[in-house]
Every structure is written in structure tokens, then in C-alpha cells.
């Protein structure tokens, strides 16, 4: 029988390269049993992680997997940085690994096709 401990499965040292102006959803996969824990996002500033109180978040349930999503609509240049999700469960605080967003400004990226465009040209 699976354990009912809450776990946060943000991949260790994961990185996401995204474009300013795009929409992006940062996923925190949350494993839990009966009661969904209270989950928050924070952004690392040096050694402290600053709670993101005023940002749009939502839960997504998909194929028996639960995600706590941090929405970037749109991505801004200052969204660059490292993020962590945390869960409060039975008075325990569980923290995820951090995940890093690398934001490319649209101005510098406007001449460059995206990875997907490059791939579709190459494999078409």
C-alpha cells in the first residue's frame, strides 16, 4: 500500500527556458491521499524564499496526478529566477527542490525561431 505522506515532486535542479510575453504554467506535482494540503509558491532571494501572495495559482488534476500551478500571464523579464513550492500538512512544512526560470526578453529573441519551430522545420 502506498504511503500517505505528502510529497512534492519538483525535479531537482530543473530549469525552464521561457520567453517574455508568453504564457507559462510552472507545475508543482503534489502527491497526497485524502486531504489536499495547503500549498504555496515562493521565489528565492538569496537564502530566503519570498512567498508569492498576490500571484495567480490554481490546482490541476490530470490522470490521477495533482499539480499546484503558478501562472505567468504573461511572463515578464523579472520572473527570471528560482522558485520553490511548499506544503503544509498536519503541521509539517514540506519544501520542494527549487526550479529555475530563465527568461529571454522578446527583443533579443524576436529574430530567433523557437526550439519547436526549428524542430518542425528540420523534421518536416
Amino acid at each position: 500500500k502506498e504511503s500517505c505522506d505528502v510529497q512534492l515532486y519538483i525535479k531537482r535542479q530543473s530549469e525552464h527556458s521561457i520567453l517574455a510575453g508568453d504564457r507559462f504554467e510552472l507545475e508543482c506535482p503534489v502527491k497526497y491521499c485524502a486531504n489536499r494540503p495547503h500549498v504555496t509558491w515562493c521565489k528565492l532571494n538569496g537564502t530566503t524564499c519570498v512567498k508569492l501572495e498576490d500571484r495567480q495559482t490554481s490546482w490541476k488534476e490530470e490522470k490521477n496526478i495533482s499539480f499546484f500551478i503558478l501562472h505567468f500571464e504573461p511572463v515578464l523579464p523579472n520572473d527570471n529566477g528560482s522558485y520553490r513550492c511548499s506544503a503544509n500538512f498536519q503541521s509539517n512544512l514540506i519544501e520542494s527542490h527549487s526550479t529555475t526560470l530563465y527568461v529571454t526578453d522578446v527583443k533579443s529573441a524576436s529574430e530567433r525561431p523557437s526550439k519547436d519551430e526549428m524542430a518542425s522545420r528540420f523534421w518536416a
Partner: antibody, heavy 118, light 111 residues
Framework: EVQLQESGPSLVKPSQTLSLTCSVT????????WNWIRKFPGNKLEYMGY???????YFNPSLKSRISITRNTSKNQYYLQLNSVTTEDTATYYC????????????WGHGTTLTVSS | DIVLTQSPASLAVSLGQRATISCRAS??????????MHWYQQKAGQPPKLLIY???NLESGIPARFSGSGSRTDFTLTINPVEADDVATYYC?????????FGGGTKLEIK
């Protein structure tokens, strides 16, 4: 049900570039992590790398200078490119999906066998 | 890289008996609060098939004859009782740290 299918050449000459395709049905490659693994003739399994739901990639440092993984979300396919192949790259190549809750590989392709020979 | 050492390299077991395969990691596998150690079965000409995930959880559709245990650096796959269909090579894998790594495999034969 999730299915993965590798396709590509079975024979490549040394110094050439290997290009493989993994076609995915039953799930979107804009969700989860999508991996390449290879199995050498001596039965050793080697993890090569992944492309994530966002399009970000990770490569095994042992291959970093030679490997790239890209995707085409409209075709729901992802690709492996391995440059400057040698006979040491002779192996069976698999694509596989990682489960979010621990990254174990819950769905695999059948594999495609590659021989590098002149 | 985390090195996974499997033992024995090969194993011959009588039908109906217990098979035990060990996997020892060069570093502790517990950075997620649980153990990201998994077990696969590979038969000739087929891809690996997931048996056990996160050390002790049985994958859907896998018979309860298969079980996994262990934590930190020492993990075990047990097959009890062994059936003829279990002839295969078994691999452990860690996904705790990049690059993911596999054990060298244990070949199970029937005595």
C-alpha cells in the same frame, strides 16, 4: 493507453549523425518528461537525457557535447540527435515517459537497434 | 554519478522458491522524502517493464509475487514464488539525482 514508437536508421557510418524519432500517442509531450535510454550489447543500460513539458532539456554529461533532444508538439514527437557516432554507440535505443511522482519510466517504446559500422 | 551495484549478477532458482536481488547505491537515495529507486524486468527482445516504483510500490498489473523493500542505500527486489515466466534480466534504477543511473542487471534463470 500511452504508446511510444521509435523510428530511425538501423545502420549509421562512423562520424555521421544519428537521428531518431519518438512518436507518442495517448498523452501529450507538453506534459511530463520524455526520455532517451540506450542498451549496449553487453546489457548495460545508459540514461541519455530528457525533454520536459516546457521544452527544457537535460543531457547526461557523458554525452553532452554530442547530443541534442528536440520536439515537435504539433506532431507529438520528440527527437534524439547524436553527433560524431562511433562503434561504441552501437546499441538499442529506447524512448520512455517519466511519471511525475518520482520520474520512474512507466511507458517505453519497443526500441530500435542501431549498428555503427563502415 | 550515483553508482548502483546489483548482486548477484546471475541467479538460478527452483520453481516455487524465493529469488532475492540486491541493489546498493553509492549515495543515499532520499532527497524527496521517499526513495526514488525503481525495479524493471527485461525479457529478451522486449523493452524494460516497470515492476516496482519508489522502492516498494507495485506497478498496476504486476503480480503480488513481486515486492520491493529498502531505503537509503540498500534495496531489495523479491520474487516469491518464482514462476517460469519470470526468466528475465532485472534492473534497479535511481531517479533521485541526474544523471539517472541503472544497476548492471541480474539475470534470473530457473534451476
Amino acid at each position: 493507453e500511452v504508446q511510444l514508437q521509435e523510428s530511425g536508421p538501423s545502420l549509421v557510418k562512423p562520424s555521421q549523425t544519428l537521428s531518431l524519432t519518438c512518436s507518442v500517442t495517448g498523452d501529450s509531450i507538453t506534459s511530463a518528461y520524455w526520455n532517451w535510454i540506450r542498451k549496449f550489447p553487453g546489457n548495460k543500460l545508459e540514461y541519455m537525457g530528457y525533454i520536459s513539458y516546457s521544452g527544457s532539456t537535460y543531457f547526461n554529461p557523458s554525452l553532452k557535447s554530442r547530443i541534442s533532444i528536440t520536439r515537435n508538439t504539433s506532431k507529438n514527437q520528440y527527437y534524439l540527435q547524436l553527433n560524431s557516432v562511433t562503434t561504441e554507440d552501437t546499441a538499442t535505443y529506447y524512448c520512455a515517459r517519466s511519471h511525475y511522482y518520482g520520474y520512474y519510466f512507466d511507458y517505453w517504446g519497443h526500441g530500435t537497434t542501431l549498428t555503427v559500422s563502415s | 554519478d550515483i553508482v548502483l551495484t546489483q548482486s548477484p549478477a546471475s541467479l538460478a532458482v527452483s520453481l516455487g522458491q524465493r529469488a532475492t536481488i540486491s541493489c546498493r547505491a553509492s549515495e543515499t537515495i532520499d532527497s524527496y522524502g521517499d526513495s526514488l529507486m525503481h525495479w524493471y524486468q527485461q525479457k529478451a527482445g522486449q523493452p524494460p517493464k516497470l515492476l516496482i516504483y519508489r522502492a516498494s510500490n507495485l506497478e498496476s498489473g504486476i503480480p503480488a509475487r513481486f515486492s520491493g523493500s529498502g531505503s537509503r542505500t540498500d534495496f531489495t527486489l523479491t520474487i516469491n514464488p518464482v514462476e517460469a515466466d519470470d526468466v528475465a534480466t532485472y534492473y534497479c534504477q535511481q531517479t533521485d539525482e541526474d544523471p539517472y543511473t541503472f544497476g548492471g542487471g541480474t539475470k534470473l534463470e530457473i534451476k
